[in-house]
């Protein structure tokens, strides 16, 4: 349907493919791509070659190509400013001549290894109350955090560490729509030096 918007996730500096999925390539005469401005025109190549792309905006020069036979569009070397709405006006021999496909391109950084910050809050009867905070280097959008083995969600984990839990390893997994990465801390490290009281510990 013309009204549907297809979300496409891309990774900063890498490539993304807009799925046009033309079923009958012979039908296609031209596809006009627009975003904030005109982006490119795609026309059929010779019978055995990929479609021909004419880039119409300097921001996209040498970064766009189209794949045969389905006319999927590829933007490479993605930049943050590439994010936004895209429209493909597909002109074919079939009625109604021109149909429109709409896309929303979201661009994310590939997540680096997260850091676990440890804060010892209190220690009573060989049980210590520890807060673990997991964070990625740059403040990123759409990042979710998960802790194992507890299955807790969110970037902050509060634990009450007992001697029996010494063999546990706590792993934080940070995830966004295009990547995930993890860091771990062993339970032994958490309350190793109670005498020092409150402290912050960075792993990695």
């Amino acid at each position: 349907k013309d009204s549907e918007i297809f979300t496409v996730n891309g990774i900063l500096g890498e490539s993304v493919t807009f799925p046009v999925n033309i079923q009958e390539p012979r039908q296609v005469k031209i596809i006009a791509w627009t975003s904030k401005t005109s982006v490119a025109y795609v026309t059929p190549g010779d019978s055995e070659t990929a479609p021909v792309v004419t880039v119409t905006h300097r921001n996209y020069y040498e970064r766009i190509h189209a794949l045969g036979p389905n006319y999927n569009l590829v933007i490479s070397d993605l930049r943050m400013e590439d994010a936004g709405d895209y429209k493909a006006d597909i002109n074919t021999q079939a009625d109604p001549y021109t149909t429109t496909k709409r896309y929303n391109l979201q661009i994310y950084r590939r997540l680096g290894k997260p850091k676990i910050t440890q804060s010892l809050m209190a220690s009573v009867n060989s049980t210590c109350n520890v807060t673990l905070t997991c964070s990625v280097e740059k403040e990123e959008k759409n990042v979710t955090y998960n802790w194992s083995p507890l299955g807790e969600e969110g970037n902050v984990l509060q634990i009450f560490q007992t001697p029996e839990d010494q063999e546990l390893t706590y792993t934080c997994t940070a995830q966004n729509p295009v990547s995930n990465n993890s860091d771990s801390i062993s339970a032994r490290q958490l309350c190793a030096d109670i005498a020092m009281g409150f402290r912050t510990h960075h792993t990695g």
Epitope: R26, K29, Q93
Partner: antibody
Framework: QVQLQQPGAEVVQPGTSVKLSCKAS?????NYWINWVKLRPGQGLEW???????????NYNEKFKRKATLTVDTSSSTGNMQLSSLASEDSALYYC?????????WGQGTLVTVSA | DIVLTQSPASLAVSLGQRATISCRAS??????????MHWYQQKPGQPPKLLIK???NLESGVPARFSGSGSGTDFTLNIHPVEEEDTATYYC?????????FGGGTKLEIK
């Protein structure tokens, strides 16, 4: 309703050029390719080329590549075809037609006569 | 370029009978989904009129006595029953590739 308006006739001298026009109305001009077709008595129909108004993208029949130049003026919804270095064999009826691959709408044609 | 050969070059058919016009392409103009062949009618002093698109699909407003068939390289236009007003020249045209080409035309006369 859809209309493609063409001048009725042009009389031109050999070696000169002529610019034929095709004014479209009654439909979204940008969505349809403007095609040009040549008709000579006893020779049938020949497709010259087409142009897409949105982008100015053109396709030409190799036979007419040096003879015809297609342009559009989207502000006036007009397609144009310039014929250069005119000779007697260019005397013909020239139609514009709109459509993608097939031609649903036609102008009445412009009769070009090349005569000294 | 794809050459379209129409036959016969002319034919005369009695009123109410069937007229059959053939168009043969020098190479296939069909995929598994579509045949890229179209038919036009041209009357004297008028531009061509699209009758049939994609080998067998009747264009809007065209009488049902016109029908098209065929695929690959062989296509047929049938008119049945023919009427007086069907006196015209009929052309086939492919849109398989650039350049589009037309057949040489078939002149139909009603007896």
């Amino acid at each position: 309703q859809v209309q493609l308006q063409q001048p009725g006739a042009e009389v031109v001298q050999p070696g000169t050029s002529v610019k034929l026009s095709c004014k479209a109305s009654g439909y979204n001009f940008t969505n349809y390719w403007i095609n040009w077709v040549k008709l000579r008595p006893g020779q049938g129909l020949e497709w010259i080329g087409d142009i897409y108004p949105v982008s100015g993208t053109t396709n030409y029949n190799e036979k007419f590549k040096r003879k015809a130049t297609l342009t559009v003026d989207t502000s006036s919804s007009t397609g144009n075809m310039q014929l250069s270095s005119l000779a007697s064999e260019d005397s013909a009826l020239y139609y514009c037609a709109s459509g993608t691959g097939r031609f649903a709408y036609w102008g009445q044609g412009t009769l070009v006569t090349v005569s000294a | 370029d794809i050459v379209l050969t129409q036959s016969p070059a002319s034919l005369a058919v009695s009123l109410g009978q069937r007229a059959t016009i053939s168009c043969r392409a020098s190479q296939s103009v069909s995929t598994s989904s579509y045949s890229y062949m179209h038919w036009y009618q041209q009357k004297p002093g008028q531009p061509p009129k699209l009758l049939i698109k994609f080998a067998s699909n009747l264009e809007s407003g065209v009488p049902a006595r016109f029908s098209g068939s065929g695929s690959g390289t062989d296509f047929t236009l049938n008119i049945h029953p023919v009427e007086e007003e069907d006196t015209a020249t009929y052309y086939c045209q492919h849109s398989w590739e650039i350049p589009y080409t037309f057949g040489g035309g078939t002149k139909l006369e009603i007896k």
